[in-house]
């Protein structure tokens, strides 16, 4: 089978990824690969900002525009991706540059289904191999990266690198970050003027931009702060060993005085603002089951209380190449039955201290509409319907037939393509609706195909409550009530009057009200009344009555 297409038809050979901690990057900056630009066969052009240096492995599905669809993302902000053309075979760079906007909104963003895995993973505190986020939680402004094709990405004003590693054997979590921000908002490039007499810097200067990794021990529920310095520094009150400050309690501040023989007083005073415990947060799938075929909702839940200032906690999500600074995200207009990978992290004072990845498979979508080939009545009590099944997967059909206000529904085998309806009422209009359904997280019904027919005529039922009364010596008045079932298009009442075996009268009226005059006196007559619906006569109602001896 072909690779699984994304909602927009884009398929990736592997998830876009930037190593979170392993690759050396200049000056702890956020890494983004250049944009890949595809020229489309169909005269559309499309840009893809890939989070992988490996963007040449990105492929485009063959689905052309058939499967192209936009999707929305909602959280702090709502993002509607453009309707993206697909069907590309070349990777010719386009003129100009591509832009990618971060901070909860995206331009030209696409969400790719993950190829391969069926597993749902929810691993807080484990290494996330597929996300590096531009860390700018405090800036209210949107940072726009201007990405040149196959060149180093231009950096946002604030440059930072967040790394996270996990070792399954020691239950420690590691997170670090460095930030350099100039007053003008651009990245600082330090230059050193070479003096004739070398002098030692102060420790305060030397360790001004020291970074710290917080390692969390799930057993002791304590943190260790690892000081990221090249040499073995000394800490006041011997608070550190091998550049590590141990046994730090969550949400408590600790002050560390850092010195070294390569620098002079004053020492660097480092305030360690310890984050909350990792296990106090849980990444929760908040997708409504009814919408699980085309939406994904993810939300960080605080499952235990802590004393840290919640204002200092920021959340970040990355799904495909879309990044959101929200505690909860909602992705919409996704493809049913596709896997999507979202990476998320939580930062405390801009230091990442936990992360989680989720691979979520969207639910089965509603089946398409079956195509009715024909439906017709071939007899008074029968009808037949034939159809072609819908394109998408489904479990069964529901066939409903409605006459006037009565509705009957049947559950039909998914392999049926024809069905005979029995015991129908003659000369009655039936409206049929046929839909396929699938039982997934909820039952999803496909669109119904409709058709109608009118059953053939049949003999009407018998007239009833027939009366014969004498109005004079030689006259009779015959009345009856209409049949319960006319079963045909027309309405006519017939009266046949027989004396012995001889037909003496044959009358037809719109109503069952006959006045029979000039009969012979003292004669036995047989009165037969029946209804005719234009196609068939009904069973006659028969009464016997005699005229009397003439009174004059």
């Amino acid at each position: 089978q072909s690779p699984t297409p994304s909602p927009t038809g884009l398929t990736t050979a592997k998830m876009p990824s930037v190593p979170l901690s392993s690759d050396p990057l200049p000056t702890h900056t956020t890494a983004f690969s250049p944009a890949s630009t595809f020229e489309r066969e169909n005269d559309f052009s499309e840009t893809t900002t890939s989070l992988s240096p490996d963007n040449t492995s990105t492929q485009v599905s063959p689905d052309s525009l058939d499967n192209a669809s936009a999707f929305n993302t909602t959280g702090v902000s709502s993002v509607q991706t453009p309707h993206l053309p697909t069907h590309a075979d070349s990777q010719t760079p386009s003129a100009g540059t591509d832009t990618q906007t971060f901070s909860g909104s995206a331009a030209n963003a696409k969400l790719n289904p993950t190829p391969g895995s069926n597993a749902i993973s929810d691993v807080p505190g484990e290494r996330s191999t597929a996300s590096t986020f531009p860390t700018d939680p405090v800036s209210p402004l949107t940072t726009t990266l201007s990405l040149a094709h196959h060149s180093s990405a231009a950096l946002p004003a604030r440059t930072s690198n967040t790394t996270i590693t996990a070792n399954t054997s020691d239950a420690y979590l590691n997170a670090s970050e460095t930030t350099t921000l100039s007053p003008s908002g651009s990245a600082v490039i330090s230059t050193t003027t070479i003096a004739t007499t070398p002098s030692k810097p102060t420790c305060d200067e030397k360790y001004a931009n020291i970074t710290v990794d917080y390692l969390y021990n799930k057993e002791t529920k304590l943190f260790t702060a690892k000081l990221n310095v090249n040499e073995n520094v000394e800490c006041g009150n011997n608070t550190c060993t091998n550049n590590e400050v141990h046994n730090l309690t969550e949400c408590k501040n600790a002050s560390v005085s850092i010195s070294h023989n390569s620098c002079t007083a004053p020492d660097k005073t480092l305030i360690l603002d310890v984050p909350p415990g990792v296990e106090k947060f849980q990444l929760h799938d908040c997708t409504q089951v009814e919408k699980a075929d085309t939406t994904i909702c993810l939300k960080w839940k605080n499952i235990e209380t802590f004393t840290c200032d919640t204002q200092n906690i920021t959340y970040r999500f990355q799904c495909g190449n879309m990044i959101f600074d929200n505690k909860e995200i909602k992705l919409e207009n996704l493809e049913p039955e596709h896997e999507y990978k979202c990476d998320s992290e939580i930062l405390y004072n801009n230091h990442k201290f936990t992360n989680a990845s989720k691979i979520i498979k969207t639910d089965f979508g509603s089946p398409g509409e079956p195509q009715i080939i024909f439906c017709r009545s071939e007899a008074a009590h029968q009808g037949v319907i034939t159809w072609n099944p819908p394109q998408r997967s489904f479990h069964n059909f529901t066939l409903c037939y409605i006459k006037e206000t009565e509705k009957d529904c049947l559950n039909l085998d998914k392999n049926l393509i024809k069905y005979d309806l029995q015991n129908l009422k003659p000369y009655t209009k039936y409206v049929l609706s046929l839909h396929a359904y699938i039982i997934a997280k909820v039952q999803r019904n496909g669109s119904a195909a409709m058709c109608h027919f009118t059953t053939k005529s049949a003999p009407p039922s018998q007239v009833w409550n027939m009366t014969v009364s004498m109005t004079s010596d030689n006259s009779m008045h015959v009345k009856c009530r209409p049949p319960r079932d006319r079963n045909g298009p027309h309405e006519r009442y017939h009266l046949e009057v027989e004396a012995g075996n001889t037909l003496v009268r044959n009358e037809s009226h719109k109503n069952c009200d006959f006045r029979v005059k000039d009969l012979q006196y003292s004669t036995d007559y047989t009165f037969k009344a029946y209804f005719h619906n234009g196609d068939y006569p009904g069973e006659p109602f028969i009464l016997h009555h005699s005229t009397s001896y003439n009174s004059k």
Epitope: Q1, Q371, I373, N388, P389, Q391, R392, S393, F394, D413, N415, L416, I417, K418, Y419
Partner: antibody, heavy 123, light 107 residues
């Protein structure tokens, strides 16, 4: 005796087009759903497309959707596969197959196959 | 899509022996499974449908079993003409998918 005979295969360049035909005999062609199945060299079978009795409904595998078109001519008892934007991965033997169809039921398996026609997509 | 995992890929046996081929579906497919035989220069032939129903003309030494996710094709008392490639196919849902095939060779 049910017979299905494919034709129209051969060598075509990437990006090119080709039309395959399948001549059917020995059964009432219009009473059956029909299909194309392919097999890349030294690989397994892959369903390509299916079509309803009169051609009003068509069904495609993901890898060919938007590029291939299945059609039929019931008067000529012939099934067709129009292949556009061909790629090297479309190189395969293409089989015409009849789907198991009764008056009331359709089952998506293949009760009769043709011997196949080879399509090579190469520059 | 429903993935069909067929095993073994190769199987060597002698005439008169019995062999079994396994086919596993990635999700339940009820009994919507067919088995086919493929020989060079011949049209593919359906052997079994609905998991265990022999197609008219299939010799009784062939049998199919299973439902849900696990299926098998058994050939008892192998005949020389049985040496071929065998494929399973699910038809529970579209896209229709096949197993990767089992080549049955003479030992």
């Amino acid at each position: 005796e049910v017979q299905l005979v494919e034709s129209g295969g051969g060598l075509v360049q990437p990006g090119g087009s080709m039309k395959l035909s399948c001549a059917a005999s020995g059964f009432t062609f219009s009473d059956y759903y029909m299909a194309w199945v392919r097999q890349a060299p030294k690989k397994g079978l892959e369903w390509v497309a299916s079509m309803s009795f009169a051609g009003s409904s068509t069904y495609y595998g993901d890898s060919v959707k938007g590029r291939f078109t299945i059609s039929r001519d019931n008067a000529k008892t012939t099934l067709y596969l129009q292949m556009n934007s061909l790629r090297s991965e479309d190189t395969a033997t293409y089989y015409c197959a009849r789907m198991y169809t009764t008056d009331y039921y359709l089952y998506w398996y293949f009760d009769f196959w043709g011997p196949g026609t080879m399509v090579t997509v190469s520059s | 899509d429903v993935q069909m995992t067929q095993s073994p890929s190769y199987l060597a046996a002698s005439p008169g022996e019995s062999v079994s081929i396994s086919c596993k579906a990635s999700k339940s497919i009820s009994n919507y499974l067919a088995w086919y035989q493929q020989k060079p220069g011949e049209a593919n032939k359906i052997l079994i449908y609905s998991g265990s129903t022999l197609q008219s003309g299939t010799p009784s030494r062939f049998s199919g079993s299973g439902s849900g996710t696990d299926f098998s094709l058994t050939i008892r008392n192998l005949e020389p003409e049985d040496f071929a490639v065998y494929y399973c196919q699910q038809y529970d849902e579209k896209p229709l998918t096949f197993g990767s095939g089992t080549k049955l060779e003479i030992k």
